[in-house]
Amino acid sequence: EVEKTACPSGKKAPEIDESLIFYKKWELEACVDAALLATQMDRVNAIPFTYEQLDVLKHKLDELYPQGYPESVIQHLGYLFLKMSPEDIRKWNVTSLETLKALLEVNKGHEMSPQVATLIDRFVKGRGQLDKDTLDTLTAFYPGYLCSLSPEELSSVPPSSIWAVRPQDLDTCDPRQLDVLYPKARLAFQNMNGSEYFVKIQSFLGGAPTEDLKALSQQNVSMDLATFMKLRTDAVLPLTVAEVQKLLGPHVEGLKAEERHRPVRDWILRQRQDDLDTLGLGLQG
């Protein structure tokens, strides 16, 4: 805590500028008006204050806004954001996507910190749902963001937001998450034609039920093995050899290399040997 001392004569700061980097901590505390700081927060980011000095500036803002900072201040926090605790951020009401982007930019290149996670949580809860623009922004900064959400949280994603999702955004999702996302994707892409639909739905298929896989097998989609290996085992087991052959098309030969891995292993064990032999791959049930 900085000791409270009177500001020396002639040192009262008329504005926030680089001359303040020469102030000791107690001088910053005594000579910088908190209201002035709040209105000129955008200047702080341009000045290489030490972390110690930033602590003093944060303390001044905390005293001015004990209930939490207004968005006009939050938007211009810059690297002072890195000094905020999750407890500080829980007091904020961030509604502007521009504010969110500005703060995510500060943390860019780093893993998602507890501060950022809290900020995102506050923002999304404030909006009531993960709309497309928000999802676009979050996945641009953190490709794994979607898969960090619980199935319950994912249930608030409207189907229209699914258009913002890229295949790499789903790389770390588990089956429970894809179970929630797949029906939304199916709804979002329902008006697309066969081949275009498959391109879009492909990365969500880890949540697809058997009947949808059967339907896809009738559309010459040529699913690759990597996608097939991510399908739910319980959805694959009821598929016939003919259906899997149609689903994979020319990629069916890849089953041999995967015969010891789920879901291929379990599927093979469910098939009649005569049917497997029709593939000519030497698969043993």
């Epitope: 341009a46 000045i47 290489p48 690297y79």
Partner: nanobody, 121 residues
Amino acid sequence: EVQVVESGGGLVQPGGSLRLSCAASGITFSGNYGGWFRQAPGEQRELVASMSSALGTKYADPVKGRFTISTDTAKNTVDLQMNSLGPEDTAVYYCYARVRLSRGGWGSEYWGQGTQVTVSS
């Protein structure tokens, strides 16, 4: 790993001169921010001199005209030439480096361990 190391401190008589040098590894002073702080006994740390392409060269009022900060890009050092030293300049002097972010603003900061400068007869 970034390291910032000071050298050149010592005991000097009033009116004398000293040259402090700060060598950095893992960060270049060119395009970033380099400075010298000092901390006298019982006092808080204060910036003495700094330089960066963004802000130019700056000095604290008590040292203006006596201290000169300079950088050697080839050696990646920031030096502080101190002339006309007085007892009030006695302190531990710290080198400071700050990363300038390409998108604006300032990133991580790095401090040296400090070097003692004592001005006494």
